[in-house]
């Protein structure tokens, strides 16, 4: 399905609004430090050019690839070397190396100021004064902070952002209407970004076989009534979509995602009974709805897998004839029977089955060798079940903040070399698993918890790759995607770590502490807790709890004082001295 002009093809398929939005996202994800106005100028130039190609596909340069066109445009930025340093060297390369070079320079933790939310009236005025610019600014600000955000999904977020302002700026109480909607979009956006980052890491670090295995398991859970061939087709198409988006091919990705949504809605009967309400929605909403759709009900009478995968005399023959197809069918059959398992567990089981067949099909008596293969799965299943049970009990006992603190201590002891901000961010997010998953019924807890933890631990891996400091983190992150979480769970106190020297400055606080939001106060206290553990890795839970309780009391006391700064200056050193004594 070749086109004389790729840019004209995509412009016509996507329409001007989505075309411009996606080009803005692509440019903002590549050049994360460029000012908004610069990006808008580049997008307008590309859009005008695309229109000339729609009018005449044979016009000059219209036959060039999108990477060539976009790369050439990015390389016209005057301040490229001053702003981005060695990324400017990408411009000396030819495609496809130039695009690969841009991809490698995407920064998962860009040095950008946190987004500050202006007053509601200020935002509403900006929205009414220039709605188009207001929404472009949203796409730009999110895309540059989240360089792997799933671009067609970001367009959906922008549509919801627009709808929130359109509704709430007319409301009697604008703030009461708007702020909860913006909070929800922010939280959902962060979650969406992190989930997509894992998909891209899976494709880029472990290859499309790893991503396809993930997709087979997840789609088989979602669509247990679908045939294997149907699931395989969806997996192939979904892999293409995510490969494109993760590779910066955002126009192709969005176009193919729309095609996939169309296919699913035209073939609901052979996929799932749950797609109906998604398929009545407009495109962006429909694609989002299909991605989030609940699992269909399992068929009533699915037989045990023993006959085909253990008892059959043809197991090794079937495996040898088409290994990946046979393992794919095994994964499909297992996953459709177990919506109560995490995808990562299902992938571990498929890996264990594969390892058994590799060993046994070369043995003298293969059947005798693999006869008990399913018994070997029991400990693999029970490990995450027990982990979820124990951690949900701890969460229910402690509440979210103290549960986060327990994880902060646990992870700082495991990998104390990791930077404090990273440990705080990751542990806070690990701790959110409790509120997210522990309230769910038993059959939904493990898939919720373990697959969420995989997303959070991927963030640790991505940040650590940028600045590697711990061999243990590198090992857990790179050896096996499916075993990352068990690898981190198995880490113990790092005995080789030399405790960090005590620095009183780290534990010096001021009156500004009192004006912080509850969340910011927690982050400050948790930062101090990580530093304490880095200073005294062998401190007991009781010792750390004592210090943290004293800390909370000290802050509360000084924030109630008339002269807050004087209180902090006087009580701070006493707190530090008492803490050192308690941890001695």
């Amino acid at each position: 399905d070749t086109h004389k002009s790729e840019v004209a093809h995509r412009f016509k398929d996507l329409g001007e609004e989505h075309f411009k939005g996606l080009v803005l996202v692509a440019f903002s994800q590549y050049l994360q430090q460029c000012p908004f106005e610069e990006h808008v100028k580049l997008v307008n130039e590309v859009t005008e050019f695309a229109k000339t190609c729609v009018a005449d596909e044979s016009a000059e340069n219209c036959d060039k690839s999108l990477h060539t066109l976009f790369g050439d445009k990015l390389c016209t930025v005057a301040t490229l070397r001053e702003t981005y340093g060695e990324m400017a060297d990408c411009c000396a390369k030819q495609e496809p190396e130039r695009n690969e070079c841009f991809l490698q320079h995407k920064d998962d933790n860009p040095n950008l100021p946190p987004l500050v939310r202006p007053e509601v009236d200020v935002m509403c005025t900006a929205f009414h004064d220039n709605e188009a610019t207001f929404l472009k600014k949203y796409l730009y600000e999110v895309a540059r902070r989240h360089p792997y955000f799933y671009a067609p999904e970001l367009l959906f977020f922008a549509a919801r952002y627009k709808a929130a302002f359109a509704e709430c700026c007319q409301a009697a109480d604008k703030a009461a209407c708007l702020l909860p909607k913006l909070d929800e979009l922010r939280d959902e956006g962060k979650a969406s970004s992190a989930k997509q980052r894992l998909k891209c890491a899976s494709l880029q670090k472990f290859g499309d076989r790893a991503f396809k295995a993930w997709a087979v398991a997840r789609l088989s859970q979602k669509f247990p009534k679908a045939e294997f061939a149907e699931v395989s087709k969806l997996v192939t198409d979904l892999t293409k979509v995510h490969t494109e988006c993760c590779h910066g091919d955002l126009l192709e990705c969005a176009d193919d995602r729309a095609d996939l949504a169309k296919y699913m809605c035209e073939n609901q009967d052979s996929i799932s009974s749950k797609l109906k309400e998604c398929c009545d929605k407009p495109l962006l909403e429909k694609s989002h709805c299909l991605a989030e759709v609940e699992n269909d009900e399992m068929p009533a009478d699915l037989p045990s897998l023993a006959a085909d995968y253990v008892e059959s005399k043809d197991v090794c023959k079937n495996y040898a004839e088409a290994k990946d197809v046979f393992l794919g069918m095994f994964l499909y059959e297992y996953a459709r029977r177990h919506p109560d398992y995490s995808v990562m567990l299902l992938l571990r089981l498929a890996k264990a089955y594969e390892a058994t067949l590799e060993k046994c099909c070369a043995a003298a008596d293969p059947h005798e060798c693999y006869a008990k293969v399913f018994d070997e799965f029991q400990p693999l299943v029970e490990e995450p079940q027990n982990l979820v049970k124990q951690n949900c009990e701890l969460f229910e006992q402690l509440g979210e903040y103290k549960f986060q603190n327990a994880l902060l201590v646990r992870y700082t002891k495991k990998v104390p070399q990791v930077s404090t901000p990273t440990l705080v961010e990751v542990s806070r997010n690990l701790g959110k698993v409790g509120a997210k998953c522990c309230k769910l019924p038993e059959a939904k807890r493990m898939p919720c918890a373990e697959d969420y933890l995989s997303v959070v631990l991927n963030r640790l891996c991505v940040l650590h790759e940028k600045t590697p400091v711990s061999e243990k983190v590198t090992k857990c992150c790179t050896e096996s995607l499916v075993n990352r979480r068990p690898c981190f769970s198995a880490l113990e106190l790092d005995e080789a770590y030399v405790p960090k020297a005590f620095n009183a400055e780290t534990f010096t606080f001021h009156a500004d502490m009192c004006t912080l939001s509850e969340k910011e106060k927690q982050v400050k206290k948790q930062t101090a807790l990580v530093e304490l553990v880095k200073h005294k890795p062998k401190a007991t839970k009781e010792q750390l709890k004592g210090v943290m309780d004293n800390f909370a009391a000290f802050v509360e006391k000084c924030c109630k004082a008339d002269d807050k700064e004087a209180c902090f200056a006087e009580e701070g050193p006493k707190f530090v001295a008492a803490s050192q004594a308690a941890l001695a």
Epitope: P303, S304, A306, R337, H338, F377, V381, A443
Partner: nanobody, 115 residues
């Protein structure tokens, strides 16, 4: 070794009720299906009701609205509440529990509906 034991069968008049219980002993993990089947004299064994790990329930058309299947995961128990019994419900009722590694059946319990 896994053993399933059904109980609760018996003789009941038309319109009456019975509650069947099935208890699994031994090491069974990863259950994805629990079901009740029945076999009347000279007939094939047929599915009466099943419940899957996601909580989905399925009923034979002939028992819909009269029978209710339920389970207790923590005890590996499955139940069948049978109301408005009819003579056609007379059969041996079998409990079935499945995991990926096997299909486990009980010995059956007789249900007779007769006046």
């Amino acid at each position: 070794q896994v053993q399933l034991v059904e109980s609760g069968g018996g003789l009941v008049q038309p319109g009456g009720s019975l509650r069947l219980s099935c208890s699994a002993s031994g090491s069974i993990w990863g259950i994805y299906h629990m079901g009740w089947y029945r076999q009347a004299p000279g007939k094939q064994r047929e599915l009466v009701a099943s419940i899957t790990v996601d909580g989905s329930t399925h009923y034979a058309d002939t028992v819909k609205g009269r029978f209710t299947i339920s389970r207790d995961n923590s005890k590996n128990m499955v139940y069948l509440q049978m109301n408005s019994l009819e003579p056609e419900d007379t059969a041996v009722y079998y409990c079935d529990i499945r995991n990926v590694g096997g299909d486990y059946w009980g010995q059956g319990t007789q249900v007779t509906v007769s006046s």
